[in-house]
Each structure stands twice: as structure tokens, then as C-alpha cells.
């Protein structure tokens, strides 16, 4: 019956990890909905065999028959699809054989490489395996405190599993959280076990608890939301940065600028230059040259540092970190002093053309 092989999803483990693992890819047994399926456990000397589906113990019921080394599924449904395993327990060790069951109308004919990232939150579980709710992705729940600027969107996640499929409800400060409790309501995505609130306001501050439950149990997780009110101000630059620096000719130097801004800042590094021997134009404004600005190949983190490699005397002078947002502009300056390299003559290089900005 096997029709094709599929890459084994190593994120699924049987309840008791075996001491020997199947090296080949698991075989795939394909059935159409309503069909019956019989699979033989391909393990030698299998005295005691236990079965699992998607890592959960599989027991007999009115549709699933377990006789010796055979598994029979009567009247298959798409929910019977999954990764199955039979484990032979012996006195010395145990061995597990994996296989896939695919109950679908359309018969597949190749590896499904797009479907093996194991990232899916929502899992269809076999209706035979009763299980209390459990968290499926605790990584997504680690950040309990969310400090979010006003008007932003916030998302809380509680990815869970269980059988029957658990329901999820949300509490705010320990009480039922209703749509009418906030202007604009909120969005719940059960498929991804998440709550979304758009355009948060100070009144949204509080504790948000997801309660995930089925008839076999209940679990919950609490997040704290703090809404930071935006204070309209121009960018704030960290005091003392950039700092004055000195280096010898041929050396390297870096200037650092730390920018804090609620509104999206635009950051530039500028050098004060001379034109015709003068630092200022006829209008009294300084001649400036933009050295680095956020753009195609720079992230905010990269723009915060200005590197000058293989320094020449001409690099000496005043450097300015300028940050602007919709409210205003802030800038800090620092000086670069270039010292002659030991035993080298002073370099003289021609000045490039500069634009008045």
C-alpha cells in the first residue's frame, strides 16, 4: 500500500523515546475518506507492541482495532491522518517503526517539502486520544510584560493543543473580556490561539489571561500590558555620544550615536568641511557633507555607528550625528584628531568637491 515517502518530522516523539530509531523515511499509507486501512507493524520479535499517533498513545475503540502486530482503522477520516508509530518493548531495549497515514480525496505523488517546518499551531488530533489541554509553543509565551506605545497593535498568544480541541477565552484583570469593554473591540484568532488589540490606549492597561479548556482540564497564562503614552518630542541623543576621538594616520576610528525617539527617526552622520578655505557659506551656514544616512543598505543599528578606516589628516575635524523626526531635530558633535604616524611625513591630499547643504 505505501505510495510515497515523506521526510520524517523529528519534532514529533513517541511518549517513551525508543532506544533505536528508524533511519529510513517513514512509509506513507494513503486512504480515501470512508475506506478501511490495515497496517502491519514491521518490527521483528515484537512481543509487546504499543501504538502512538502524533506522539499520543493510541488505544482501541469502535473505529480503531489493535490486534497483535496489526492496526486497523475503519471508515477513515482526514483526522486520522498523521504520524503513527508502533513500539516493540523487549527486555533489553525497545524499537520503534514510524509510518504516515494520509486520508485525503486527492492521492499525492511526491515529497511535500513545503509542509515539514512543523510550525503549525493548530493540530487535528485523532478523536480516540483524549487529552487535557497543553501548551504547544511556550517560546511564544515567554514575554509576559508588554510595554507598548499608545496607538500600536498588541498580540498575545497562547498556542495550545488537546483532545477534544480545547476552547480559548480571554479575561481582563480576572474578569470576562468582552468586545464592548474596549473601543473598537478586539480580534481573536482561534486558529492561532491569539488575541489582538489594535490602537491601544491607556485604559487597555492590565492583566490579560487566556484560559484554554476542554472536558479533561484547563490551563491559563497571564500577560501584563502597559500602554506607554507617547510624549511628542524630538529625538533624544545619549549624553556624551559621539565622544571625541584621536588616532594616528592609517588607523581606524568609530563614532557612536545612540538615538531614542517615539516617532520614527531619520539619522545622518555629517562632517563639517571647508570650501575655498572657509567653513561657512555667505549665508553664515556651515558647509556640511553627509557621510552616512539610513537607506538601502543600512539598518538603524548600523547607522548608529560611523566607521572611518585608514584615517588621513583630511579626516580630522568635526563630526555630527543628526537625528530628526516629525517633531524636530537633535544633534551631537565630536572631534576627530589625527596624529602623525611615527616616522612618517605629513600627508597632503587634494580636497574633493563639496556641496553646500
Amino acid at each position: 500500500r505505501p505510495s510515497f515517502s515523506l521526510v520524517e518530522d523529528t519534532t514529533l516523539e513517541p511518549e517513551e523515546p525508543p532506544t533505536k530509531y528508524q533511519i529510513s523515511q517513514p512509509e506513507v499509507y494513503v486512504a480515501a475518506p470512508g475506506e478501511s486501512l490495515e497496517v502491519r507493524c514491521l518490527l521483528k520479535d515484537a512481543a509487546v507492541i504499543s501504538w502512538t499517533k502524533d506522539g499520543v498513545h493510541l488505544g482501541p475503540n469502535n473505529r480503531t482495532v489493535l490486534i497483535g502486530e496489526y492496526l486497523q482503522i475503519k471508515g477513515a477520516t482526514p483526522r486520522d491522518s498523521g504520524l503513527y508509530a508502533c513500539t516493540a518493548s523487549r527486555t533489553v531495549d525497545s524499537e520503534t517503526w514510524y509510518f504516515m497515514v494520509n486520508v485525503t480525496d486527492a492521492i499525492s505523488s511526491g515529497d511535500d517539502e513545503d509542509d515539514t517546518d512543523g510550525a503549525e499551531d493548530f493540530v487535528s488530533e485523532n478523536s480516540n486520544n483524549k487529552r487535557a489541554p497543553y501548551w504547544t509553543n511556550t517560546e511564544k509565551m515567554e514575554k509576559r510584560l508588554h510595554a507598548v506605545p499608545a496607538a500600536n497593535t498588541v498580540k498575545f498568544r497562547c498556542p495550545a493543543g488537546g483532545n477534544p480541541m480545547p476552547t480559548m477565552r480571554w479575561l481582563k484583570n480576572g474578569k470576562e473580556f468582552k468586545q464592548e469593554h474596549r473601543i473598537g473591540g478586539y480580534k481573536v484568532r482561534n486558529q492561532h490561539w491569539s488575541l489582538i488589540m489594535e490602537s491601544v490606549v491607556p485604559s487597555d492597561k492590565g492583566n490579560y489571561t487566556c484560559v484554554v479548556e476542554n472536558e479533561y482540564g484547563s490551563i491559563n497564562h497571564t500577560y501584563h500590558l502597559d500602554v506607554v503614552e507617547r510624549s511628542p518630542h524630538r529625538p533624544i541623543l545619549q549624553a556624551g555620544l559621539p565622544a571625541n576621538a584621536s588616532t594616528v594616520v592609517g588607523g581606524d576610528v568609530e563614532f557612536v550615536c545612540k538615538v531614542y525617539s517615539d516617532a520614527q527617526p531619520h539619522i545622518q552622520w555629517i562632517k563639517h568641511v571647508e570650501k575655498n578655505g572657509s567653513k561657512y557659506g555667505p549665508d553664515g551656514l556651515p558647509y556640511l557633507k553627509v557621510l552616512k544616512a539610513a537607506g538601502v543598505n543600512t539598518t538603524d543599528k548600523e547607522i548608529e555607528v560611523l566607521y572611518i578606516r585608514n584615517v588621513t589628516f583630511e579626516d580630522a575635524g568635526e563630526y555630527t550625528c543628526l537625528a530628526g523626526n516629525s517633531i524636530g531635530i537633535s544633534f551631537h558633535s565630536a572631534w576627530l584628531t589625527v596624529l602623525p604616524a611615527p616616522g612618517r611625513e605629513k600627508e597632503i591630499t587634494a580636497s574633493p568637491d563639496y556641496l553646500e547643504i
Epitope: P78, S81, T104, D117, V123, S124, T153, Q191, H192, E198
Partner: antibody, heavy 117, light 107 residues
Framework: QVQLVQSGAEVKKPGSSVKVSCKAS????????ISWVRQAPGQGLEWMGY????????HYAQKFQGRVTITADESTSTAYMELSSLRSEDTAVYYC??????????WGQGTLVTVSS | DIQMTQSPSSLSASVGDRVTITCRAS??????LAWYQQKPGKAPKLLIY???ILQSGVPSRFSGSGSGTDFTLTISSLQPEDFATYYC?????????FGQGTKVEIK
């Protein structure tokens, strides 16, 4: 191989409606949400809405609210997107896309809808 | 809705070049960002999800980085088949939004 196969190109008059289908094969249809994304000629991608067949959830982009209806038929593993009150600026390629977790991992081949009088 | 600003809108590069495309979100989106490649007349293809995880079958010359509001897609050594349009997608808010796209052309 999981595949999403969409219905063929359509030419529609302004003011009319269009219904595009998206049939899934080779996977468990109800375990995933299906989104619809459109792309006007020479333009970028624009998300329209999604349906989660198993959970019975739909959500639409604000821009299309009231004009778009997304449905699914689990028995045929098919999702549908109906857009009403068509205008010339709705001329676009319409894609269905399967959500794996929350991003779109598998896309249909696209359906060109031309709105012209 | 969360706005995604992608830059540059187009760039010209040669085979073997290192190419960087950036995407900036109007607010923090954690790491809920994916990158897609689209060739003319074809559907988009998933390259990277969760900011930096390479989709199965995608060459390792593609990489993603960033968090919060600033994200980068890097192609370490551009190949002839990489000339295409690239889009970022935020899926933090379920009103999904794409960047405007970056067209990578042959210099």
C-alpha cells in the same frame, strides 16, 4: 505535494460580481486557513481577507469590508472569494494562499480578473 | 494597520554581488516577518519566515535578520535566477500588510 488550484480568468462588467475558487489537494484542508491576496498590474501585493474552515473564522481587510465574502466548502476542499460592486481598479490577479502558522507558505497559480465595460 | 516600508524600490546588481533589502514596520512586530520572491507571471514564493528561518528548499545564500521594526533580507552572492521582485510581509497583526516590493535587476 500540497497544491492550490484556482479557477480560470474572468472578464466582468463594472458593478457586477466575481467568484474565484481555490481547490486544495494533497493535504488536510480544514487544518489551515486560506487567505486571498490580490495584485493589480505592475503593483504590489495586497491582502484581502482569510477564512479558517475548521474554526469557522473569517476576517477581511478594512478596504474590502462589505464587498468581499470568503467561504469554504470542506467537502470539496475548496475556498471561494467573491468580490462585488466591481470597478476598473479591481482588475488584478487574485491569489489564494495557505497559511502555515501565520505566514503564507503555498500559493495558488493566480486568477486574472479583468473589469471592463 | 501596520505599515511596511521597503527600500529600495529597485536596485541594479551583478551576478556575485551581495544584495541587501530592508523593511521597516511602523511599530514593533516582534519577529513576525516573512520574505517572498516573485518572478513575472508567477505566484510569490516563500523564502524566509519568522524573520530569519529559511523555508525548506531555499538556497542558503538567502538570509534574514532584524527584530522589532527593522528587518533585512540579504542575498550573499546574487545568482542569475535571483533577479526578481522581493516583498516583506508582516503577520503580527492579522490585517496582514506587505512592503511595496524591491525589484532586483541586472546591472
Amino acid at each position: 505535494q500540497v497544491q492550490l488550484v484556482q479557477s480560470g480568468a474572468e472578464v466582468k462588467k463594472p458593478g457586477s460580481s466575481v467568484k474565484v475558487s481555490c481547490k486544495a489537494s494533497g493535504g488536510t484542508f480544514s487544518s489551515y486557513a486560506i487567505s486571498w491576496v490580490r495584485q493589480a498590474p505592475g503593483q504590489g501585493l495586497e491582502w484581502m481577507g482569510y477564512i479558517s474552515p475548521y474554526m469557522g473564522e473569517t476576517h477581511y481587510a478594512q478596504k474590502f469590508q462589505g464587498r468581499v465574502t470568503i467561504t469554504a466548502d470542506e467537502s470539496t476542499s475548496t475556498a471561494y472569494m467573491e468580490l462585488s460592486s466591481l470597478r476598473s481598479e479591481d482588475t488584478a490577479v487574485y491569489y489564494c494562499a495557505r497559511e502555515s502558522y501565520e505566514y503564507f507558505d503555498i500559493w495558488g497559480q493566480g486568477t486574472l480578473v479583468t473589469v471592463s465595460s | 494597520d501596520i505599515q511596511m516600508t521597503q527600500s529600495p524600490s529597485s536596485l541594479s546588481a551583478s551576478v556575485g554581488d551581495r544584495v541587501t533589502i530592508t523593511c521597516r514596520a511602523s511599530q514593533s512586530i516582534s519577529n513576525d516577518l516573512a520574505w517572498y520572491q516573485q518572478k513575472p507571471g508567477k505566484a510569490p514564493k516563500l523564502l524566509i519566515y519568522a524573520t530569519s528561518i529559511l523555508q525548506s528548499g531555499v538556497p542558503s545564500r538567502f538570509s534574514g535578520s532584524g527584530s522589532g521594526t527593522d528587518f533585512t533580507l540579504t542575498i550573499s552572492s546574487l545568482q542569475p535566477e535571483d533577479f526578481a521582485t522581493y516583498y516583506c510581509l508582516q503577520y503580527y497583526d492579522y490585517s496582514y500588510t506587505f512592503g511595496q516590493g524591491t525589484k532586483v535587476e541586472i546591472k
